[in-house]
Protein backbone atom coordinates (compact mmCIF):
# COMPACT_ATOMS: atom_id res chain seq x y z
CA UNK A 1 0.00 0.00 0.00
CA UNK A 2 1.15 3.54 -0.65
CA UNK A 3 2.25 5.59 2.32
CA UNK A 4 -0.76 7.63 3.53
CA UNK A 5 0.98 10.99 3.16
CA UNK A 6 1.78 10.26 -0.47
CA UNK A 7 -1.75 9.36 -1.36
CA UNK A 8 -3.47 12.45 0.00
CA UNK A 9 -4.94 14.55 -2.77
CA UNK A 10 -6.47 17.99 -2.54
CA UNK A 11 -9.59 18.13 -4.64
CA UNK A 12 -11.51 21.33 -5.28
CA UNK A 13 -14.86 21.56 -6.94
CA UNK A 14 -17.69 24.07 -7.33
CA UNK A 15 -20.91 23.38 -5.46
CA UNK A 16 -24.40 24.47 -6.51
CA UNK A 17 -24.25 27.28 -3.99
CA UNK A 18 -21.07 28.58 -5.63
CA UNK A 19 -18.86 27.79 -2.65
CA UNK A 20 -15.66 25.93 -3.38
CA UNK A 21 -15.41 22.60 -1.60
CA UNK A 22 -12.13 20.96 -0.67
CA UNK A 23 -11.31 17.54 0.68
CA UNK A 24 -8.24 15.54 1.67
CA UNK A 25 -10.04 12.25 1.31
CA UNK A 26 -8.73 8.97 0.01
CA UNK A 27 -10.13 7.62 -3.19
CA UNK A 28 -11.94 4.39 -2.26
CA UNK A 29 -9.76 2.48 -4.72
CA UNK A 30 -6.78 3.37 -2.54
CA UNK A 31 -8.25 1.59 0.46
CA UNK A 32 -6.37 -1.63 0.80
CA UNK A 33 -6.86 -4.54 3.12
CA UNK A 34 -3.45 -4.09 4.66
CA UNK A 35 -3.83 -0.33 5.04
CA UNK A 36 -4.31 -0.69 8.79
CA UNK A 37 -0.79 -2.09 9.06
CA UNK A 38 0.62 1.05 7.44
CA UNK A 39 -1.51 3.53 9.28
CA UNK A 40 -0.82 4.33 12.90
CA UNK A 41 -1.39 8.07 12.86
CA UNK A 42 -1.38 10.54 10.00
CA UNK A 43 -1.26 14.26 10.69
CA UNK A 44 -1.80 16.70 7.87
CA UNK A 45 -1.42 20.47 7.81
CA UNK A 46 -4.24 21.76 5.68
CA UNK A 47 -4.71 25.38 4.58
CA UNK A 48 -8.34 26.09 3.64
CA UNK A 49 -9.80 29.33 2.31
CA UNK A 50 -12.44 31.02 4.39
CA UNK A 51 -16.03 30.74 3.12
CA UNK A 52 -15.34 27.48 1.26
CA UNK A 53 -16.66 24.09 2.32
CA UNK A 54 -14.23 21.54 3.73
CA UNK A 55 -14.56 17.77 4.12
CA UNK A 56 -12.26 16.01 6.58
CA UNK A 57 -11.86 12.28 6.32
CA UNK A 58 -11.18 9.42 8.65
CA UNK A 59 -8.58 6.73 8.05
CA UNK A 60 -9.80 4.47 5.23
CA UNK A 61 -11.02 1.61 7.39
CA UNK A 62 -13.92 -0.49 6.09
CA UNK A 63 -17.09 0.49 7.95
CA UNK A 64 -17.88 -3.15 8.67
CA UNK A 65 -14.77 -3.33 10.88
CA UNK A 66 -15.71 -0.29 12.91
CA UNK A 67 -16.88 -0.17 16.51
CA UNK A 68 -16.68 3.55 17.22
CA UNK A 69 -15.93 6.61 15.10
CA UNK A 70 -14.97 9.73 17.04
CA UNK A 71 -14.11 13.20 15.85
CA UNK A 72 -12.17 15.39 18.28
CA UNK A 73 -12.22 19.09 17.47
CA UNK A 74 -9.91 21.47 19.29
CA UNK A 75 -10.51 25.12 18.44
CA UNK A 76 -8.66 28.05 19.97
CA UNK A 77 -10.16 29.23 23.24
CA UNK A 78 -12.86 26.57 23.35
CA UNK A 79 -13.30 23.29 25.22
CA UNK A 80 -12.56 20.22 23.13
CA UNK A 81 -15.62 19.10 21.15
CA UNK A 82 -16.16 15.40 20.50
CA UNK A 83 -18.62 13.70 18.18
CA UNK A 84 -18.75 9.96 18.67
CA UNK A 85 -20.76 7.27 16.90
CA UNK A 86 -21.16 3.71 18.21
CA UNK A 87 -21.99 1.46 15.33
CA UNK A 88 -23.37 -1.54 17.21
CA UNK A 89 -26.03 0.37 19.08
CA UNK A 90 -26.37 3.18 16.52
CA UNK A 91 -25.71 5.85 19.14
CA UNK A 92 -24.20 9.28 18.69
CA UNK A 93 -22.71 11.36 21.48
CA UNK A 94 -21.67 14.98 21.29
CA UNK A 95 -19.78 16.84 24.00
CA UNK A 96 -19.09 20.61 23.97
CA UNK A 97 -20.01 20.92 20.28
CA UNK A 98 -21.79 24.21 19.69
CA UNK A 99 -20.84 25.14 16.11
CA UNK A 100 -23.65 24.01 13.82
CA UNK A 101 -21.44 24.45 10.75
CA UNK A 102 -19.38 21.41 11.77
CA UNK A 103 -21.40 18.25 11.10
CA UNK A 104 -21.18 14.66 9.89
CA UNK A 105 -21.31 14.59 6.09
CA UNK A 106 -24.25 12.19 6.33
CA UNK A 107 -25.36 9.48 8.73
CA UNK A 108 -22.15 8.30 10.41
CA UNK A 109 -23.01 4.65 9.80
CA UNK A 110 -22.80 5.44 6.08
CA UNK A 111 -20.04 8.05 5.99
CA UNK A 112 -17.58 8.85 8.75
CA UNK A 113 -16.40 12.13 7.22
CA UNK A 114 -16.81 15.53 8.87
CA UNK A 115 -17.80 18.65 6.99
CA UNK A 116 -17.45 22.35 7.71
CA UNK A 117 -20.01 24.37 5.75
CA UNK A 118 -18.78 27.05 5.32
CA UNK A 119 -15.34 27.48 6.82
CA UNK A 120 -15.08 30.48 9.14
CA UNK A 121 -12.04 32.10 10.68
CA UNK A 122 -12.98 30.51 14.02
CA UNK A 123 -12.48 27.03 12.55
CA UNK A 124 -8.70 27.28 12.84
CA UNK A 125 -7.64 24.31 14.94
CA UNK A 126 -6.95 20.61 15.19
CA UNK A 127 -9.38 17.96 13.98
CA UNK A 128 -8.80 14.28 14.64
CA UNK A 129 -10.75 11.22 13.59
CA UNK A 130 -10.32 8.17 15.81
CA UNK A 131 -11.58 4.87 14.47
CA UNK A 132 -11.93 2.11 17.04
CA UNK A 133 -11.60 -1.36 15.53
CA UNK A 134 -10.87 -4.83 16.90
CA UNK A 135 -7.31 -4.34 15.61
CA UNK A 136 -6.77 -1.14 17.59
CA UNK A 137 -7.45 2.55 17.21
CA UNK A 138 -6.51 4.37 14.01
CA UNK A 139 -6.16 8.13 13.77
CA UNK A 140 -6.05 10.86 11.22
CA UNK A 141 -5.46 14.43 12.31
CA UNK A 142 -5.73 17.74 10.51
CA UNK A 143 -4.13 21.01 11.54
CA UNK A 144 -6.66 23.22 9.77
CA UNK A 145 -5.34 26.66 8.89
CA UNK A 146 -8.06 29.02 7.73
CA UNK A 147 -6.81 31.39 5.05
CA UNK A 148 -8.29 34.86 4.61
CA UNK A 149 -7.58 36.77 1.43
CA UNK A 150 -6.33 40.28 2.24
CA UNK A 151 -7.67 43.35 0.52
CA UNK A 152 -4.83 45.11 -1.26
CA UNK A 153 -4.59 48.87 -1.69
CA UNK A 154 -1.83 51.01 -3.18
CA UNK A 155 -1.65 54.78 -3.02
CA UNK A 156 0.76 57.67 -2.98
CA UNK A 157 0.67 59.74 0.17
CA UNK A 158 3.64 62.11 -0.20
CA UNK A 159 6.08 63.12 -2.89
CA UNK A 160 7.74 59.97 -4.23
CA UNK A 161 6.28 57.89 -1.36
CA UNK A 162 3.80 55.06 -1.90
CA UNK A 163 1.88 52.96 0.56
CA UNK A 164 0.85 49.36 -0.14
CA UNK A 165 -1.52 47.72 2.32
CA UNK A 166 -2.67 44.10 2.55
CA UNK A 167 -5.60 44.41 4.92
CA UNK A 168 -6.92 41.65 7.22
CA UNK A 169 -5.16 38.68 5.67
CA UNK A 170 -4.49 35.35 7.32
CA UNK A 171 -1.68 34.54 7.56
CA UNK A 172 0.15 37.83 7.08
CA UNK A 173 0.86 38.70 3.45
CA UNK A 174 4.35 39.55 2.21
CA UNK A 175 4.90 42.78 0.34
CA UNK A 176 7.74 43.43 -2.07
CA UNK A 177 8.43 46.34 -4.43
CA UNK A 178 9.80 46.77 -7.92
CA UNK A 179 12.06 48.62 -8.00
CA UNK A 180 13.25 48.39 -4.41
CA UNK A 181 12.98 51.61 -2.44
CA UNK A 182 13.62 52.85 1.05
CA UNK A 183 10.85 50.88 2.76
CA UNK A 184 9.36 50.42 6.20
CA UNK A 185 6.88 47.62 6.90
CA UNK A 186 4.47 47.44 9.81
CA UNK A 187 2.14 44.66 10.87
CA UNK A 188 -1.09 45.15 12.76
CA UNK A 189 -2.59 42.08 14.42
CA UNK A 190 -6.35 41.81 14.87
CA UNK A 191 -8.18 39.86 17.55
CA UNK A 192 -9.73 37.51 14.99
CA UNK A 193 -6.30 36.31 13.88
CA UNK A 194 -5.97 38.39 10.74
CA UNK A 195 -3.05 40.68 10.06
CA UNK A 196 -2.81 43.97 8.19
CA UNK A 197 0.56 44.55 6.56
CA UNK A 198 1.48 48.11 5.57
CA UNK A 199 4.58 48.86 3.53
CA UNK A 200 5.60 52.47 2.99
CA UNK A 201 8.35 53.13 0.43
CA UNK A 202 10.18 56.22 -0.71
CA UNK A 203 12.21 56.60 -3.93
CA UNK A 204 14.81 59.39 -4.06
CA UNK A 205 15.92 58.45 -7.58
CA UNK A 206 13.97 60.70 -9.91
CA UNK A 207 14.15 58.39 -12.90
CA UNK A 208 11.76 56.00 -11.11
CA UNK A 209 8.33 56.95 -12.40
CA UNK A 210 6.30 53.75 -11.92
CA UNK A 211 6.49 51.42 -8.94
CA UNK A 212 4.88 48.01 -8.46
CA UNK A 213 3.71 46.55 -5.19
CA UNK A 214 3.68 42.77 -5.22
CA UNK A 215 1.63 41.03 -2.52
CA UNK A 216 2.31 37.36 -1.91
CA UNK A 217 -0.24 35.31 0.01
CA UNK A 218 -1.22 31.64 0.35
CA UNK A 219 -4.56 32.44 -1.28
CA UNK A 220 -2.87 33.94 -4.33
CA UNK A 221 -0.59 36.79 -5.41
CA UNK A 222 -1.48 40.28 -6.58
CA UNK A 223 0.52 43.08 -8.21
CA UNK A 224 -0.55 46.71 -8.37
CA UNK A 225 1.40 49.58 -9.89
CA UNK A 226 1.24 53.32 -9.50
CA UNK A 227 2.86 56.31 -11.17
CA UNK A 228 4.79 58.48 -8.80
CA UNK A 229 3.38 61.94 -9.31
CA UNK A 230 4.48 65.20 -7.77
CA UNK A 231 1.20 65.26 -5.86
CA UNK A 232 -0.62 62.31 -4.19
CA UNK A 233 -2.29 60.18 -6.86
CA UNK A 234 -5.43 58.10 -7.10
CA UNK A 235 -5.93 55.22 -4.71
CA UNK A 236 -5.74 51.70 -6.16
CA UNK A 237 -7.60 48.81 -4.53
CA UNK A 238 -7.93 45.12 -5.25
CA UNK A 239 -8.81 41.75 -3.73
CA UNK A 240 -6.32 38.97 -4.36
Amino acid sequence: AAQPNNSLMLQTSKENHALASSSLCMDEKQITQNYSKVLAEVNTSWPVKMATNAVLCCPPIALRNLIIITWEIILRGQPSCTKAYRKETNETKETNCTDERITWVSRPDQNSDLQIRPVAITHDGYYRCIMVTPDGNFHRGYHLQVLVTPEVTLFQNRNRTAVCKAVAGKPAAQISWIPEGDCATKQEYWSNGTVTVKSTCHWEVHNVSTVTCHVSHLTGNKSLYIELLPVPGAKKSAKL
Partner: antibody, heavy 120, light 106 residues
Framework: EVQLQQSGTVLVRPGASVKLSCTAS????????MHWVKQRPEQGLEWIGR????????KYAPKFQDRATITADTSSNTAYLQLSSLTSEDTAVYYC?????????????WGQGTTLTVSS | QIVLTQSPALTSASPGEKVTMTCSAS?????MYWFQQKPRSSPKPWIY???KLASGVPARFSGSGSGTSYSLTISSMEAEDAATYYC?????????FGAGTKLELK
Protein backbone atom coordinates in the same frame (compact mmCIF):
# COMPACT_ATOMS: atom_id res chain seq x y z
CA GLU B 1 -7.13 8.60 39.22
CA VAL B 2 -10.61 7.57 38.05
CA GLN B 3 -12.98 6.73 40.89
CA LEU B 4 -16.71 6.21 41.33
CA GLN B 5 -17.91 6.80 44.88
CA GLN B 6 -21.39 5.51 45.65
CA SER B 7 -23.75 6.38 48.51
CA GLY B 8 -23.80 4.12 51.56
CA THR B 9 -26.12 1.33 52.63
CA VAL B 10 -29.82 2.26 52.49
CA LEU B 11 -32.77 0.71 54.33
CA VAL B 12 -36.25 1.67 53.12
CA ARG B 13 -39.86 0.58 53.55
CA PRO B 14 -41.84 -1.15 50.79
CA GLY B 15 -43.67 1.33 48.57
CA ALA B 16 -41.16 4.08 49.21
CA SER B 17 -38.70 5.66 46.76
CA VAL B 18 -34.94 5.98 46.96
CA LYS B 19 -32.29 7.97 45.11
CA LEU B 20 -28.82 6.49 44.92
CA SER B 21 -25.81 8.59 43.99
CA CYS B 22 -22.54 7.97 42.20
CA THR B 23 -19.95 10.73 42.32
CA ALA B 24 -17.12 10.59 39.82
CA SER B 25 -13.59 11.89 40.22
CA UNK B 26 -10.68 11.85 37.82
CA UNK B 27 -12.90 12.41 34.78
CA UNK B 28 -15.83 14.49 33.64
CA UNK B 29 -19.05 12.48 33.41
CA UNK B 30 -20.25 14.74 30.59
CA UNK B 31 -17.61 13.14 28.38
CA UNK B 32 -18.79 9.60 29.09
CA UNK B 33 -21.79 7.31 29.56
CA MET B 34 -22.90 6.34 33.07
CA HIS B 35 -24.65 2.99 33.54
CA TRP B 36 -26.40 1.33 36.48
CA VAL B 37 -26.33 -2.42 37.18
CA LYS B 38 -28.32 -4.40 39.75
CA GLN B 39 -27.16 -7.52 41.58
CA ARG B 40 -29.54 -9.36 43.87
CA PRO B 41 -28.05 -11.42 46.72
CA GLU B 42 -26.27 -14.51 45.39
CA GLN B 43 -27.46 -13.72 41.86
CA GLY B 44 -26.12 -12.34 38.61
CA LEU B 45 -25.79 -8.89 37.10
CA GLU B 46 -28.74 -7.04 35.57
CA TRP B 47 -28.40 -3.93 33.44
CA ILE B 48 -30.83 -1.19 34.50
CA GLY B 49 -30.01 1.62 32.09
CA ARG B 50 -27.65 4.41 31.18
CA UNK B 51 -27.44 8.16 30.75
CA UNK B 52 -25.44 10.39 28.45
CA UNK B 53 -24.81 13.31 30.83
CA UNK B 54 -23.92 15.60 27.93
CA UNK B 55 -27.56 15.73 26.86
CA UNK B 56 -29.45 13.70 29.50
CA UNK B 57 -30.40 11.08 26.92
CA UNK B 58 -31.32 7.85 28.71
CA LYS B 59 -31.96 4.22 27.84
CA TYR B 60 -33.53 1.61 30.13
CA ALA B 61 -34.04 -2.11 30.22
CA PRO B 62 -37.80 -2.76 29.70
CA LYS B 63 -38.04 -4.34 33.14
CA PHE B 64 -36.94 -1.09 34.82
CA GLN B 65 -38.48 1.43 32.42
CA ASP B 66 -41.43 2.33 34.64
CA ARG B 67 -39.77 2.51 38.05
CA ALA B 68 -36.21 3.63 37.43
CA THR B 69 -35.06 7.15 36.60
CA ILE B 70 -31.44 7.89 35.83
CA THR B 71 -30.28 11.51 36.04
CA ALA B 72 -26.98 13.33 36.10
CA ASP B 73 -25.71 16.59 37.52
CA THR B 74 -22.62 17.63 35.59
CA SER B 75 -21.84 20.48 38.00
CA SER B 76 -21.29 18.00 40.84
CA ASN B 77 -20.07 15.24 38.48
CA THR B 78 -22.68 12.90 39.90
CA ALA B 79 -25.05 10.34 38.39
CA TYR B 80 -28.22 9.26 40.18
CA LEU B 81 -30.55 6.28 40.12
CA GLN B 82 -34.03 6.79 41.52
CA LEU B 83 -36.23 3.75 42.17
CA SER B 84 -39.89 4.10 43.06
CA SER B 85 -42.60 1.80 44.46
CA LEU B 86 -39.99 -0.38 46.09
CA THR B 87 -40.60 -4.03 46.93
CA SER B 88 -38.46 -6.76 48.48
CA GLU B 89 -37.41 -7.69 44.93
CA ASP B 90 -35.45 -4.45 44.82
CA THR B 91 -33.22 -5.56 47.67
CA ALA B 92 -29.85 -5.71 45.95
CA VAL B 93 -26.47 -4.11 45.44
CA TYR B 94 -26.60 -1.35 42.83
CA TYR B 95 -23.45 -0.49 40.90
CA CYS B 96 -22.70 2.52 38.79
CA UNK B 97 -20.18 2.00 36.02
CA UNK B 98 -18.85 4.12 33.21
CA UNK B 99 -18.05 3.73 29.55
CA UNK B 100 -15.54 6.24 28.23
CA UNK B 101 -17.36 8.34 25.65
CA UNK B 102 -14.73 8.81 22.95
CA UNK B 103 -13.30 5.36 22.38
CA UNK B 104 -14.51 3.21 25.27
CA UNK B 105 -16.00 -0.15 24.41
CA UNK B 106 -16.71 -1.60 27.84
CA UNK B 107 -17.48 -0.84 31.51
CA UNK B 108 -13.96 0.10 32.58
CA UNK B 109 -14.58 1.51 36.06
CA TRP B 110 -17.16 0.46 38.65
CA GLY B 111 -18.33 1.99 41.91
CA GLN B 112 -18.08 0.00 45.13
CA GLY B 113 -21.84 -0.59 45.07
CA THR B 114 -24.72 0.61 47.22
CA THR B 115 -26.60 -2.01 49.23
CA LEU B 116 -30.33 -1.31 49.21
CA THR B 117 -32.53 -3.24 51.61
CA VAL B 118 -36.32 -3.02 51.27
CA SER B 119 -37.97 -4.26 54.40
CA SER B 120 -40.87 -3.43 56.66
CA GLN C 1 -33.74 -8.98 24.05
CA ILE C 2 -30.65 -11.11 23.63
CA VAL C 3 -30.39 -13.88 26.22
CA LEU C 4 -26.91 -15.06 27.20
CA THR C 5 -26.59 -18.61 28.56
CA GLN C 6 -23.41 -19.47 30.41
CA SER C 7 -22.16 -22.95 31.03
CA PRO C 8 -21.27 -24.57 33.22
CA ALA C 9 -22.96 -22.69 36.05
CA LEU C 10 -20.40 -24.10 38.47
CA THR C 11 -17.02 -25.67 37.84
CA SER C 12 -13.87 -26.41 39.79
CA ALA C 13 -10.29 -26.80 38.69
CA SER C 14 -6.97 -27.72 40.21
CA PRO C 15 -3.96 -25.42 39.94
CA GLY C 16 -2.33 -25.81 36.54
CA GLU C 17 -5.47 -27.21 34.93
CA LYS C 18 -6.96 -25.74 31.76
CA VAL C 19 -10.43 -24.20 32.19
CA THR C 20 -12.95 -23.29 29.51
CA MET C 21 -16.34 -21.69 30.02
CA THR C 22 -18.83 -20.78 27.32
CA CYS C 23 -21.43 -18.12 26.66
CA SER C 24 -24.17 -18.76 24.13
CA ALA C 25 -26.27 -15.89 22.73
CA SER C 26 -29.90 -16.28 21.65
CA UNK C 27 -29.07 -14.27 18.53
CA UNK C 28 -25.84 -13.22 16.87
CA UNK C 29 -23.69 -10.59 18.58
CA UNK C 30 -20.64 -8.81 17.22
CA UNK C 31 -18.47 -9.02 20.33
CA MET C 32 -18.53 -10.49 23.80
CA TYR C 33 -17.34 -8.93 27.04
CA TRP C 34 -16.36 -10.75 30.22
CA PHE C 35 -16.20 -9.61 33.84
CA GLN C 36 -14.65 -11.23 36.88
CA GLN C 37 -16.29 -10.84 40.29
CA LYS C 38 -15.14 -12.04 43.66
CA PRO C 39 -17.34 -12.10 46.79
CA ARG C 40 -18.06 -8.68 48.30
CA SER C 41 -16.32 -6.93 45.41
CA SER C 42 -17.41 -5.01 42.35
CA PRO C 43 -17.12 -6.70 38.97
CA LYS C 44 -13.86 -6.10 37.13
CA PRO C 45 -13.51 -5.79 33.35
CA TRP C 46 -11.69 -8.91 32.17
CA ILE C 47 -12.03 -9.39 28.43
CA TYR C 48 -13.44 -6.92 25.90
CA UNK C 49 -14.13 -7.09 22.19
CA UNK C 50 -14.21 -10.90 22.47
CA UNK C 51 -10.46 -11.41 22.83
CA LYS C 52 -8.75 -8.31 24.23
CA LEU C 53 -7.50 -8.55 27.80
CA ALA C 54 -8.37 -5.66 30.07
CA SER C 55 -5.55 -3.90 31.91
CA GLY C 56 -3.88 -6.09 34.51
CA VAL C 57 -5.44 -9.37 33.34
CA PRO C 58 -2.87 -12.21 33.23
CA ALA C 59 -1.90 -13.59 29.83
CA ARG C 60 -3.13 -17.08 30.79
CA PHE C 61 -6.65 -15.78 30.06
CA SER C 62 -7.96 -15.71 26.52
CA GLY C 63 -11.28 -15.12 24.84
CA SER C 64 -12.63 -16.27 21.50
CA GLY C 65 -15.79 -16.84 19.53
CA SER C 66 -18.17 -15.26 17.03
CA GLY C 67 -21.84 -15.08 16.21
CA THR C 68 -23.71 -16.85 18.99
CA SER C 69 -20.89 -18.86 20.56
CA TYR C 70 -18.15 -17.40 22.76
CA SER C 71 -15.73 -18.74 25.32
CA LEU C 72 -13.26 -17.72 28.01
CA THR C 73 -10.25 -19.97 28.59
CA ILE C 74 -7.66 -20.11 31.36
CA SER C 75 -4.61 -22.00 30.13
CA SER C 76 -3.36 -22.88 33.61
CA MET C 77 -5.60 -22.36 36.63
CA GLU C 78 -4.22 -20.41 39.56
CA ALA C 79 -5.76 -19.90 43.00
CA GLU C 80 -6.43 -16.21 42.37
CA ASP C 81 -8.62 -17.12 39.35
CA ALA C 82 -11.34 -18.54 41.61
CA ALA C 83 -14.27 -16.16 41.02
CA THR C 84 -17.52 -15.80 39.12
CA TYR C 85 -17.23 -14.83 35.45
CA TYR C 86 -20.03 -13.03 33.63
CA CYS C 87 -20.38 -12.54 29.90
CA UNK C 88 -22.13 -9.45 28.54
CA UNK C 89 -23.29 -8.30 25.11
CA UNK C 90 -23.51 -4.80 23.68
CA UNK C 91 -24.90 -5.55 20.24
CA UNK C 92 -28.37 -4.29 21.08
CA UNK C 93 -30.30 -2.70 23.89
CA UNK C 94 -31.09 -3.73 26.49
CA UNK C 95 -27.55 -4.74 27.38
CA UNK C 96 -27.63 -8.20 28.94
CA PHE C 97 -25.41 -10.36 31.13
CA GLY C 98 -25.15 -14.09 31.41
CA ALA C 99 -26.06 -15.71 34.75
CA GLY C 100 -22.39 -16.35 35.45
CA THR C 101 -19.98 -19.27 35.76
CA LYS C 102 -18.64 -19.82 39.24
CA LEU C 103 -15.10 -21.17 39.15
CA GLU C 104 -13.82 -22.78 42.33
CA LEU C 105 -10.37 -24.02 43.23
CA LYS C 106 -10.14 -27.78 43.78
Amino acid sequence: EVQLQQSGTVLVRPGASVKLSCTASGFNIKDDYMHWVKQRPEQGLEWIGRIDPANDNTKYAPKFQDRATITADTSSNTAYLQLSSLTSEDTAVYYCTRVEGRTGTYFDYWGQGTTLTVSS
Amino acid sequence: QIVLTQSPALTSASPGEKVTMTCSASSSVSYMYWFQQKPRSSPKPWIYLTSKLASGVPARFSGSGSGTSYSLTISSMEAEDAATYYCQQWSSYPLTFGAGTKLELK
